[in-house]
Amino acid sequence: LKGQEFAPSHQQVYAPLRADGDKPRAHLTVVRQTPTQHFKNQFPALHWEHELGLAFTKNRMNYTNKFLLIPESGDYFIYSQVTFRGMTSECSEIRQAGRPNKPDSITVVITKVTDSYPEPTQLLMGTKSVCEVGSNWFQPIYLGAMFSLQEGDKLMVNVSDISLVDYTKEDKTFFGAFLL
Amino acid sequence: LKGQEFAPSHQQVYAPLRADGDKPRAHLTVVRQTPTQHFKNQFPALHWEHELGLAFTKNRMNYTNKFLLIPESGDYFIYSQVTFRGMTSECSEIRQAGRPNKPDSITVVITKVTDSYPEPTQLLMGTKSVCEVGSNWFQPIYLGAMFSLQEGDKLMVNVSDISLVDYTKEDKTFFGAFLL
Amino acid sequence: LKGQEFAPSHQQVYAPLRADGDKPRAHLTVVRQTPTQHFKNQFPALHWEHELGLAFTKNRMNYTNKFLLIPESGDYFIYSQVTFRGMTSECSEIRQAGRPNKPDSITVVITKVTDSYPEPTQLLMGTKSVCEVGSNWFQPIYLGAMFSLQEGDKLMVNVSDISLVDYTKEDKTFFGAFLL
């Protein structure tokens, strides 16, 4: 077999070839959140397990202080699921001038922080009204998409109400990213 | 064009290069489930279409007896959507001492079975309370994430109630995995 | 370092190697939908932002007239999230002969159009009953899976009711695809 048989043509390749097993990747899983100070006017960020059980980081993708650190520029697929659970009273009870009240809601945001840029960028948002009829409820919000990230970017997952996150099992609430 | 222009440096490559088109991949689609014996204390597993319509398996990724067989070790993205449909009575009707009753729920679990390990591992779980007000209801649960798998691992999709799964269309309920 | 150390063996490689950064990719984000003529008996298609903000197309993946154009054959991961919002009256009020009424619903379909084939193919569908109790509601539907596509195929996202789509933020409603 001649090596040339699979040599890429000039048309095909515009970047160095690289082994897939060497790409930055992470899958983080839920841990219990302890009460902390939140930034004003910003949803609180979740912190994560990064090495026990199903969780891992590899190939220079590091997790530190609620953030995934992007080690090289490129297109990444980023995903998260957060399972929420809580209890709501019947949300159609309280009406003002015959109008239905503003429903309770649950929201997940995957946020990018770039040190050179003053404001975080919201990459993905999943938001749901919760209007269960006087009952314990639980439900997941799943997000996933591809983004062009730069070396040094940081990713985090923010939620509307940290006390409603189901932290009991690593398969219910998770966060991951991998270089394509 | 010199072949070396795209030769990876020692720093870049820690595994053999391989063509993307050669990677194990599968997308399975729903079929009508026939009644079968379920294991005690375990949600029943779905079986799948693996070659007709949108469904396929390729590059040594095989489907057999409700399982996707992992042909080589590596990091895989695994996903599934299950659409459920059913009918619930108003779940706040039945109360004991004025308290809301435990809601009905629907659950999907993507499970890994390793022959050398006695217990299956739950990789992903999506679970939702269903508390619709006296109505036919339908809704999907979607899951997807990346996991490090070993050659010989087997993947299946388990559901809380097989009789509620919408098996009518291949685009509503599906299961897939691909090597990254 | 000898180039041969990472030369793929005959067993490993059945297709030309190619750089990942050169693969067709797109992430499209929501824009306000203008009223248009819809095809009879077909859900209306959304149109998208393809270059501003988080949106991009690259490596010959083009967006035109509501469609993503597939520039080369291969296996693609395709995804979309659509966030809906609306207001429903209590949907258990209207009954016929004691039976619950047909609930309102929201549906997203990712559709493939192949010029040589008369009918579009539905690749992915997410559909949910909406039966909120007299309240403003909002919720996302997320879809994602892998499909074998041919050069020249076109992808679009159809929704059951274009007027319920939340077009306010690029992180809430989006559509993307990338060659694996």
Partner: antibody, heavy 118, light 107 residues
Framework: EVQLVQSGAEVKKPGASVKVSCKAS????????MHWVRQAPGQGLEWMGW????????NYAQKFQGRVTMTRDTSISTAYMELSRLRSDDTAVYYC???????????WGQGTMVTVSS | DIQMTQSPSSLSASVGDRVTITCRAS??????LNWYQQKPGKAPKFLIY???RLQSGVPSRFSGSGSGTDFTLTISSLQPEDFATYHC?????????FGPGTKLEIK
């Protein structure tokens, strides 16, 4: 450091009311549910209810419904529990507790002894 | 309400012993089971959540297991500071209820 500091011991007559305060520090007060749990001498722990400091919404155990009122003052990060129509079997240590999730109690106050005696 | 029972109500053991305390719920509570340690005159201390997950800072000699209705707390090798009362608590649905407690005493 997360801390909950409760008001001091109280002695009350049967039929009276008591109001116990719980001042929170070291975390975002409105971000986490505040619970009240009591423990009668030599007995187990008994959950009384919660308040969501952000919304003011409450959930009381059936046993205390109609007798307990939980309130909060977000400006001073303080939660209050008032128990009315006191009986001798209300003699107990009353704890406030906060959790990272609404269903468990990570951090506890030091407790407030309430004695109901004629 | 969901009733929680614990056994034994008290037990005597020595430093270095392995001890197991069981907790049972009157209906399934999935994995929503928490364990607390309480010493005389003190507030309870959070030990284990989600039936088996150790709260940060809790020594690894403590472990929990179970799901559904039956749960156990195990201390693999008793230390002098472990002699206390242990409470289980269900977090599945309000009203949150505690077991009556298990008093662990020095033999």
């Amino acid at each position: 450091e997360v801390q909950l500091v409760q008001s001091g011991a109280e002695v009350k007559k049967p039929g009276a009311s008591v109001k116990v305060s719980c001042k929170a520090s070291g975390y975002t007060f409105t971000g986490y549910y505040m619970h009240w749990v009591r423990q009668a001498p030599g007995q187990g722990l008994e959950w009384m209810g919660w308040i969501n400091p952000k919304s003011g919404g409450t959930n009381y155990a059936q046993k205390f419904q109609g007798r307990v009122t939980m309130t909060r003052d977000t400006s001073i990060s303080t939660a209050y529990m008032e128990l009315s129509r006191l009986r001798s079997d209300d003699t107990a240590v009353y704890y406030c507790a906060v959790g990272g999730s609404y269903d468990a109690f990570d951090i506890w106050g030091q407790g407030t002894m309430v004695t109901v005696s004629s | 309400d969901i009733q929680m029972t614990q056994s034994p109500s008290s037990l005597s053991a020595s430093v270095g012993d392995r001890v197991t305390i069981t907790c049972r719920a009157s209906q399934s509570i999935s994995s929503y089971l928490n364990w607390y340690q309480q010493k005389p005159g003190k507030a309870p201390k959070f030990l284990i959540y989600g039936a088996s997950r150790l709260q940060s800072g809790v020594p690894s000699r403590f472990s929990g297991s179970g799901s559904g209705t039956d749960f156990t707390l195990t201390i693999s090798s008793l230390q002098p500071e472990d002699f206390a009362t242990y409470h289980c608590q269900q977090g599945s649905s309000p009203p949150f209820t505690f077991g009556p407690g298990t008093k662990l005493e020095i033999k």
